[in-house]
């Protein structure tokens, strides 16, 4: 799987999950999030050569088309597959609120 | 929506579905499909500027991060959203078989 276990331990040029730390205040200008100060959102990048981790029948066909016709510009793209939530603490007035934001952390990627 | 109705009628540089006709024999080297001879598989391409059809909370955050940090290389990617099946006719020996292949035609795209 093109997941953090594999991708963070290997120098992989092709589609893989990459580490990306986002500081809420510095990178997004968000003052409203109290905790955490930031988090590893991660992101997917890298070419999808040949038939790498094809997601659907379409991406299999497109991957095959691209493999057999290398001059073609239509190739699958490396995007998130498994995502995990992030729990944040913020305040509404003086009232603390704990919220779980879904699909915030990329754990693995696929070619779609 | 970044669908065929919109994208095929507009010169859209950003993420959109693009027409791609695949000839089974010429492009894939498939002799086994009797009908159709090919089909519009289509594909997704184009940049994903901030908030363009963001798919998840992660792609929204990543889009914002990318907008506020233009030097960053981490941006969402334009990939299929809605896919439709394709019905094909082929033969097993002399017996005709009709098969519906799922997720073969891209109808719309998203930034993921």
């Amino acid at each position: 799987a093109l997941d953090t276990n594999y991708c963070f331990r290997n120098l992989e040029e092709n589609c893989c999950v990459r580490p990306l730390y986002i500081d809420f205040r510095q990178d997004l200008g968000w003052k409203w999030v109290h905790e955490p100060k930031g988090y590893y959102a991660n992101f997917c990048s890298g070419p999808c050569p040949y038939l790498r981790s094809a997601d659907t029948t379409h991406s299999t066909v497109l991957g095959l088309y691209n493999t057999l016709n290398p001059e073609a510009s239509a190739s699958p793209c490396c995007v998130p597959q498994d995502l995990e939530p992030l729990t944040i603490l913020y305040y509404v007035g003086r009232t603390p609120k704990v919220e779980q934001l879904s699909n915030m952390v990329v754990k693995s990627c696929k070619c779609s | 929506a970044l669908d065929t109705n919109y994208c095929f009628r507009n010169l859209e540089e950003n993420c959109c579905v693009r027409p791609l006709y695949i000839d089974f024999r010429q492009d894939l080297g498939w002799k086994w499909v009797h009908e159709p001879k090919g089909y519009y598989a289509n594909f997704c391409s184009g940049p994903c500027p901030y908030l363009r059809s963001a798919d998840t909370t992660h792609s929204t955050v990543l889009g914002l991060y990318n907008t506020l940090n233009p030097e960053a290389s981490a941006s969402p990617c334009c990939v299929p959203q809605d896919l439709e099946p394709l019905t094909i006719l082929y033969y097993v020996g002399r017996t005709p078989k009709v098969e519906q292949l799922s997720n073969m035609v891209v109808k719309s795209c998203k930034c993921s």
Epitope: L51, T57, T60, V61, L64, L68 | L28, G29, W30, K31, W32, Y90, V92, K97, E99, L101, S102
Partner: nanobody
Framework: QVQLVESGGGLVQPGESLRLSCTAS????????MGWFRQAPGKQRDMVAI??????SYADSVKGRFTISRDNAKNTLALQMNSLKPEDTAVYFC?????????WGPGTQVTVSS
């Protein structure tokens, strides 16, 4: 259900040749492609060569050295590997994609070492 079995792996010296074979059994129809993939320790499984009814494609690293061939009548797939290099060392897998579904063999080890 499709079953695949590879054979022909082994230990060879750099510059030597090997021929891998794969036999497919079961109901073989609607073949998108057949191919050879390889996986080195701790790495992803990567394409070596694929074959459709009348098209072939090779990974850049094996072009001019490896040749894929299919015998549809016998449901077999072969990979002739010449001028082998230490970096070709991997487990080699036969793959058949039928109507969008992947089937894999258990793999055969190829080791190139002096």
């Amino acid at each position: 259900q499709v079953q695949l079995v590879e054979s022909g792996g082994g230990l060879v010296q750099p510059g030597e040749s090997l021929r891998l074979s794969c036999t497919a059994s079961g109901s073989i129809f609607g073949v998108f492609y057949m191919g050879w993939f390889r996986q080195a320790p701790g790495k992803q499984r990567d394409m070596v060569a694929i074959s459709t009814d009348d098209r072939t494609s090779y990974a850049d690293s094996v072009k001019g050295r490896f040749t894929i061939s299919r015998d549809n009548a016998k449901n077999t797939l072969a990979l002739q590997m010449n001028s082998l290099k230490p970096e070709d060392t991997a487990v080699y897998f036969c793959n058949l994609n039928q109507l969008g579904t992947d089937y894999w063999g258990p793999g055969t080890q190829v080791t190139v070492s002096s």
